[in-house]
Interface confidence: medium
């Protein structure tokens, strides 16, 4: 997260760290007791590594009573996700067992009504991604409030040049932005999950390259079919 600040500890009980061989790889969001939603591209280079999900964490390294690492039973990427595109960049991870819920571990309601979030709406994005252009990785969860950007502006030739479909949404990126390592994490508007950070290699913090988020409401049928 660029231009953000340290989050209040355990105030986002839905927040997950998707880990590869014991190290943070991507963000994720607990959407059901045994399911975490993340981004499909996150695991493209996971190769033969051990994928796990950390729940109930604020610090990645310090012991915390609510922290627990879960093995992954099943990784279900969206069937239309492709290595070359940002479209359909969603992944559902089934935990090896139902998460132990409590004040620091709780699923987040996700948007089912397929309607765009109003431009200018302030939404919260959180993650353990890099905090500066030098690539410094934080130990504790960071967050930032970002205004939603209208699709027409986001699709300008100087911005994302038509790449933003109706299944994607944008947020402003003027110095405050999600970045590498935040992919798969939640964009939360009014206490509801609206978007998932896409995992492209986009430049961060440049206002002409807004943050791109996959709209979960657009994938409600797929999410429901996997969770069923």
């Amino acid at each position: 997260i660029l231009g953000g600040r340290e989050a209040e500890a355990h105030a986002r009980p839905y927040m997950a760290s998707v880990q590869l061989n014991g190290a943070h790889l991507c963000g994720g969001v607990l959407v059901a007791e045994q399911w975490v939603l993340s981004a499909a591209h996150c695991l493209e280079d996971a190769a033969d590594g051990k994928v796990q999900v950390l729940l109930g964490a604020h610090s990645l390294s310090q012991p915390e009573p609510s922290k627990r690492l879960y093995d992954v039973l099943r990784a279900v990427p969206h069937p239309d996700s492709q290595p070359d595109t940002i479209d359909h960049d969603l992944l559902l991870l089934q935990l090896s067992e139902k998460a132990t819920l409590g004040p620091a571990v709780r699923p987040l309601p996700w948007q089912r009504v397929d309607r765009d979030v109003a431009p200018g709406t302030l939404c919260d994005v959180a993650g353990w991604g890099i905090v500066n252009h030098a690539g410094r990785r934080p130990d504790s969860l960071q967050h930032v409030l970002l205004p939603v950007l209208d699709r027409a502006t986001c699709n300008r030739r100087t911005h994302h040049d038509g790449a933003i479909t109706e299944r994607l949404m944008c947020a402003e990126s003027n110095r405050r932005d999600s970045c590498k390592g935040d992919s798969g994490g939640p964009l939360v508007c009014g206490g509801v999950l609206e978007g998932v950070v896409t995992s492209g290699s986009r430049v961060c913090g440049n206002r002409k390259k807004p943050g791109i988020y996959t709209r979960v409401a657009s994938y409600a049928a797929w999410i429901d079919s996997v969770l069923a």
Epitope: N21, L43, E44, A46, D48, R74, V76, P79
Partner: antibody, heavy 120, light 112 residues
Framework: EVQLVESGGGLVQPKGSLKLSCAAS????????MNWVRQAPGKGLEWVAR??????????YYADSVKDRFTISRDDSESMVYLQMNNLKTEDTAMYYC???????????WGTGTTVTVSS | DVLMTQTPLSLPVSLGDQASISCRSS???????????LEWYLQKPGQSPKLLIY???NRFSGVPDRFSGSGSGTDFTLKISRMEAEDLGVYYC?????????FGGGTKLEIK
């Protein structure tokens, strides 16, 4: 550049042994599972063996046709994968490819192959 | 072992035409993780094979959109919408859901 280079092929007599090597470069070798796939002259592809990464305890898997005769192994420090072939038969004559194994997909990077000929 | 049967063995196609290759598995190839690891590879003359399609219908990096995969259960199809000269070679289907992993026998795409 991601690259796999096989070596060690050659002519060997039936019941003989041969060890193939594969040098990997351009990627984090220790996190990938690796495979050997072969192709007999004028024939189709046949998967031979797979070895997983350290995080999966270097688990190995084999085609029935080579089980108990071939052994796949790896050296992560040198980014090498090997195929020790014992008790070779004429039907083992083939081009042997070293192949990288992805997460969502299987064989995403192939070497150029090394030829093994088993003949008396 | 899962037997992968490809048809036809040989397929003469005119440039610009559509080509369709079928692959049938002897049993379901849905993996225990819920994914179907059915892939298609192209081997051009004198070259190593290259991955085209993974998980039934997903194009790999750099693969043109004239290639598409479909199917479920035990029946799968690879389609090339507009045949180009560079598409010539032998196409193989492959299942990675059950050990031992198995390839189809191959389909040779030729110019009519």
């Amino acid at each position: 550049e991601v690259q796999l280079v096989e070596s060690g092929g050659g002519l060997v007599q039936p019941k003989g042994s041969l060890k193939l090597s594969c040098a990997a470069s351009g990627f984090s070798f220790n996190t990938y599972a690796m495979n050997w796939v072969r192709q007999a002259p004028g024939k189709g592809l046949e998967w031979v063996a797979r070895i997983r990464s350290k995080s999966n305890n270097y688990a190995t898997y084999y085609a029935d046709s080579v089980k108990d005769r071939f052994t796949i192994s790896r050296d992560d420090s040198e980014s090498m994968v090997y195929l020790q072939m014992n008790n070779l038969k004429t039907e083992d004559t083939a081009m042997y490819y070293c192949v990288r194994h992805g997460y969502y997909w299987y064989f995403d990077v192939w070497g150029t192959g090394t030829t093994v000929t088993v003949s008396s | 072992d899962v037997l992968m049967t490809q048809t036809p063995l040989s397929l003469p196609v005119s440039l610009g035409d559509q080509a369709s290759i079928s692959c049938r598995s002897s049993q379901s190839i849905v993996h225990s993780d819920g994914n179907t690891y059915l892939e298609w590879y192209l081997q051009k003359p004198g070259q190593s094979p290259k991955l085209l399609i993974y998980r039934v219908s997903n194009r790999f990096s750099g693969v043109p959109d004239r290639f598409s995969g479909s199917g479920s259960g035990t029946d799968f199809t690879l389609k090339i919408s507009r045949m180009e000269a560079e598409d010539l070679g032998v196409y193989y289907c492959f299942q990675g859901s059950h050990v031992p992993y198995t390839f189809g026998g191959g389909t040779k795409l030729e110019i009519k």
